[in-house]
């Protein structure tokens, strides 16, 4: 009678993680007397996947009955395949010894490939804001893929980016791997309303990549220009003194009025206009009354935003002339700013 | 739903021979080994041997040689363990288990006793 | 045959404590073929980890297993009350399977 051989039919085998592989394996005899199993990797630190007789493998079913009579069919159905399960699976025939079985043929061998998607790209930004004309970074990391094979790409607004360099770990052979790339973005005065997006795209998305985005809102800090202005009269010896604060963003902004660089108010700004581009604007005024003041007055209009060094812009108040002739008489809404007297 | 069900406690003299009963529900014994396990009070877990029921093949830890022997019986599902020449050191539980010792009796105490 | 010896025989945790058992053996055990059991009193054991690392149904996710070669480990990452048992290695590497002596595990 031939001696038996153990036959893997399948050299390779591609199943797509979290379904079901199997792996199929023939003898041609039914001697000599011993049990299959089966085995991923060879040489003494295989791991065993599957014994006939004993051992506990929940996630391991037989293709057929190996409890008939005559059976020579030993394929098996790993179920729930993770990139972990990679590797190449052996279906061994031992004979029965003493004190343990024998190791009488091998098969082939039969590789596994898992196919894993890669997880959902996370983008993330500096960790302080930055002002316009600033170069920033933004990194995007996506794990758990197989194969190694992988796309990325970068947009902003949905033009595609350039400058950018992308890493796929590890280098050499691994059960799933992991992307990480890094982005170089010019920020302008207009992006507040931008985003930036990582598009990944990878086999087992079948053309459909995933993507990541940050908001440049998160990242930007547009500063602000002032410009103080003296308004109309509003009565006989008072000055209406306005500070428009313009094109600033996040919205976070204290301003501070100063009469010859004492303070003479402080507020945060509460009720403001947001612009198409996402900036804001905001108003401040103080009136002022001159007849209580003998000399020259020099307001001050100091603003810091966002935590940043204090910006301020200054107005001349000439005490002398009659205050119908001075400043300019721009026209400017009232949004409702405390008045302040001065006596 | 895989259960085994062994016999009851047994109380025998010194010298004498027990054999005890494992009868399997739920899967078939001649698809998987089943083994002994001994357990003093108190004590660890020794391995006594197995037995594959699909052909009466058996393998003993050599402190047990001799004085255990295993063997099955298909029809009736059931593995039996066989303990002879008692002494005081045989008080002990004996558990059979399914091949992978996922599953366990609930182990049978044999005291040896004058 | 291989012997495995189990250390500390006893010890006790508060809850939340970090437990480290651990289990020696005097020759190569294949990762595949150690196995862990919980047993408490009155009760036979439960089958707790397989293959070195891999929890059987049911048990909680605080255990976890490590090891290779002659030398593994149980490990409960947060002590909790219903823990207190004794536990068990077990290789069926090679014949005669043996078991380790088992480790006692109070709480406090």
């Known amino acids: 009678e031939e001696e038996l051989q153990v036959i893997q039919p399948d050299k390779s085998v591609l199943v797509a993680a979290g379904e079901t592989a199997t792996l199929r394996c023939t003898a041609t005899s039914l001697i000599p007397v011993g049990p299959i199993q089966w085995f991923r990797g060879a040489g003494p630190g295989r791991e065993l996947i599957y014994n006939q007789k004993e051992g506990h493998f929940p996630r391991v079913t037989t293709v057929s009955d190996l409890t008939k009579r005559n059976n020579m069919d030993f394929s098996i159905r790993i179920g729930n395949i993770t990139p972990a399960d990679a590797g190449t699976y052996y279906c061994v025939k031992f004979r029965k010894g003493s004190p343990d079985d024998v190791e009488f043929k091998s098969g082939a061998g039969t590789e596994l490939s898992v196919r894993a998607k890669p997880s959902a790209p996370v983008v993330s930004g500096p960790a302080a804001r930055a002002t316009p004309q600033h170069t920033v970074s933004f990194t995007c990391e996506s794990h758990g893929f197989s194969p190694r094979d992988i796309t990325l790409k970068w947009f902003k607004n949905g033009n595609e980016l350039s400058d950018f360099q992308t890493n796929v770990d590890p280098v050499g052979e691994s059960v799933s791997y992991s992307i990480h790339s890094t982005a170089k973005v010019v920020l302008t005065r207009e992006d507040v309303h931008s985003q930036v997006i990582c598009e990944v795209a990878h086999v087992t998305l079948q053309g459909d990549p995933l993507r990541g985005t940050a908001n440049l809102s998160e990242t930007i800090r547009v500063p602000p220009t002032l410009e103080v202005t003296q308004q109309p009269v509003r009565a006989e010896n008072q000055v209406n003194v306005t500070c428009q604060v313009r094109k600033f963003y996040p919205q976070r902004l204290q301003l501070t009025w100063l009469e010859n660089g004492n303070v003479s108010r402080t507020e945060t700004a509460s009720t403001v206009t947001e612009n198409k581009d996402g900036t804001y604007n905001w108003m401040s005024w103080l009136l002022v009354n001159v007849s209580a003041h003998r000399d020259d007055v020099k307001l001050t209009c100091q603003v810091e935003h966002d935590g940043q060094p204090a910006v301020s812009k200054s107005h001349d108040l000439k005490v002398s002339a009659h205050p119908k002739e001075q400043g300019s008489n721009t026209a400017a809404e009232n949004t409702g700013s405390n008045e302040r007297n001065i006596y | 739903e895989v259960q085994l069900q062994q016999s009851g406690a047994e109380l025998v003299k010194p010298g004498a021979s027990v054999k005890l009963s494992c009868t399997a529900s739920g899967f078939n014994i001649k698809d998987y080994y089943i083994h002994w396990v001994k357990q003093r009070t108190e004590q660890g877990l020794e391995w006594i041997g197995r037995?594959?029921?699909?052909?009466?093949?058996?393998k003993y830890a050599p402190k047990f040689q001799g004085k255990a022997t295993i063997t099955a019986d298909t029809s009736s599902n059931t593995a039996y363990l066989q303990l002879n020449s008692l002494t005081s050191e045989d008080t002990a539980v004996y558990s059979c288990a399914k091949g992978g010792f996922a599953y366990w009796g609930q182990g049978t105490l044999v005291t040896v006793s004058a | 045959q291989i012997v495995l010896t189990q250390s500390p025989a006893i010890m006790s945790a508060s809850p939340g404590e970090k437990v480290t058992l651990t289990c020696s053996a005097s020759?190569?055990?294949?990762?595949?073929?150690l196995y862990w059991y919980q047993q408490k009193p009155g009760s036979s054991p439960k089958l707790w980890i397989y293959s070195t690392s891999n929890l059987a149904s049911g048990v909680p996710a605080r255990f976890s297993g490590s090891g290779s070669g002659t030398s593994y480990s149980l490990t409960i990452s947060s002590m909790e009350a219903e823990d207190a048992a004794s536990y068990f290695c077990?290789?069926?590497?090679?014949?005669?399977?043996?078991f380790g002596g088992g480790t006692k595990l109070e709480i406090k």
């Open positions: 020759s190569s055990v294949s990762s595949s073929y």
């Open positions: 077990h290789q069926w590497s090679s014949h005669p399977y043996t």
């Open positions: 037995i594959d029921p699909e052909d009466g093949e058996t």
